[in-house]
Amino acid sequence: QEEDLPRPSISAEPGTVIPLGSHVTFVCRGPVGVQTFRLERESRSTYNDTEDVSQASPSESEARFRIDSVSEGNAGPYRCIYYKPPKWSEQSDYLELLVKETSGGPDSPDTEPGSSAGPTQRPSDNSHNEHAPASQGLKAEHLYHHHHHH
């Protein structure tokens, strides 16, 4: 039987409360051997895939998704999943991105990702590896910044 894949984690740098117009980077982490990380938003069909996966530690890989200039439209819950042939992982917990006016008060503390969001059904998939659908070279800002689409 195939080994279960550990759930990914998600975090945000420099934090989850971001001033309007500033940048944020989502960091997805999983085990070594991940081929594709995917960043998703709740209740949406749009996503951003990357195969630019680096080794964060001897037992962990990561991918980074940067939004250069956040708008109100970027606020909301984000999560990661990953593909380690031949299986997809479960989804990470949701991480809520808050966008604040630049004239606002002091920064809120960073939100750390939770450890578990409960079990998710796993695929019974023994398929061969396939190339992921083409990402068309789009940046996360284009995918998630649609209120000020370039």
Partner: antibody, heavy 117, light 110 residues
Framework: EQSLESGGGLITPGGTLTLTCTAS????????MNWVRQAPGKGLEWIGY?????KTYYANWAKGRFTISKTSTTVDLKMTSLTAEDTGTYFC??????????????WGPGTLVTISS | ELVLTQTPASVSEPVGGTVTIKCQAS??????LAWYQQKPGQPPKLLIY???RLASGVSSRFGGSGSGTEFTLTISDLECADAATYYC????????????FGGGTEVVVK
């Protein structure tokens, strides 16, 4: 690459029917696999999709009565409490091009479901 | 909930002419809109995605534009083979939707 729906036919009101979409040339777990239906002479109606770790989304009207599941090569649509309004052609369509699971670039020919007593 | 309104319901133009179909979203969807062509007895065919990107193998006579809530499909230099029903589809939201497709526009080529 292609997909083919099967399992359609004539069924009585109140019954349950499961349609199957069989993929060839690609692996369904790497894509968003959608079900779309079309009543005779009417427009397209999205039912829902499944992807990744069997994550599903459904149209509001389909929740509870329709269930999508999958294996590595097939995607099933289970329909319960069928009525005459469920009569139509049911399509299986692959999504994922252009970074959206709702961009449907590969469609099966469809299978006809008729609900009648 | 997000609703797509397609106009007109039907349009008739001569060979060589131009057809413009509009799709209005009840809330902003950025550029997450696709267009499909469907001929009788056939499944739909993806023409355009992300509002203006041409799908593989689709003629450049088809063009898409718009963002936010207003979108347009333009078919230029009409051919008899373009006679079909055209549907827009929002490609962003999968939660709290009744349908992702617009109502369709029948194109008749005279």
């Amino acid at each position: 690459e292609q997909s083919l729906e099967s399992g359609g036919g004539l069924i009585t009101p109140g019954g349950t029917l499961t349609l199957t979409c069989t993929a060839s040339g690609f692996t369904v777990t790497r894509y968003y696999m959608n079900w779309v239906r079309q009543a005779p002479g009417k427009g397209l109606e999205w039912i829902g999709y499944i992807y990744a770790s069997s994550k599903t989304y459904y149209a509001n009207w389909a929740k509870g009565r329709f269930t999508i599941s999958k294996t590595s090569t097939t995607v099933d649509l289970k329909m319960t409490s069928l009525t005459a309004e469920d009569t139509g052609t049911y399509f299986c369509a692959r999504g994922g091009v252009g970074n959206s699971g709702l961009n449907l670039d590969l469609w099966g020919p469809g299978t006809l479901v008729t609900i009648s007593s | 909930e997000l609703v797509l309104t397609q106009t007109p319901a039907s349009v008739s133009e001569p060979v060589g002419g131009t057809v413009t179909i509009k799709c209005q979203a009840s809330q902003s969807i950025g550029s997450w809109l696709a267009w499909y062509q469907q001929k009788p007895g056939q499944p739909p065919k993806l023409l355009i995605y992300q509002a203006s990107r041409l799908a593989s193998g689709v003629s450049s006579r088809f063009g898409g534009s718009g963002s936010g809530t207003e979108f347009t499909l333009t078919i230029s230099d009409l051919e008899c083979a373009d006679a079909a029903t055209y549907y827009c589809q929002q490609a962003e939201y999968s939660g709290d939707v009744e349908n992702t497709f617009g109502g369709g526009t029948e194109v008749v080529v005279k």
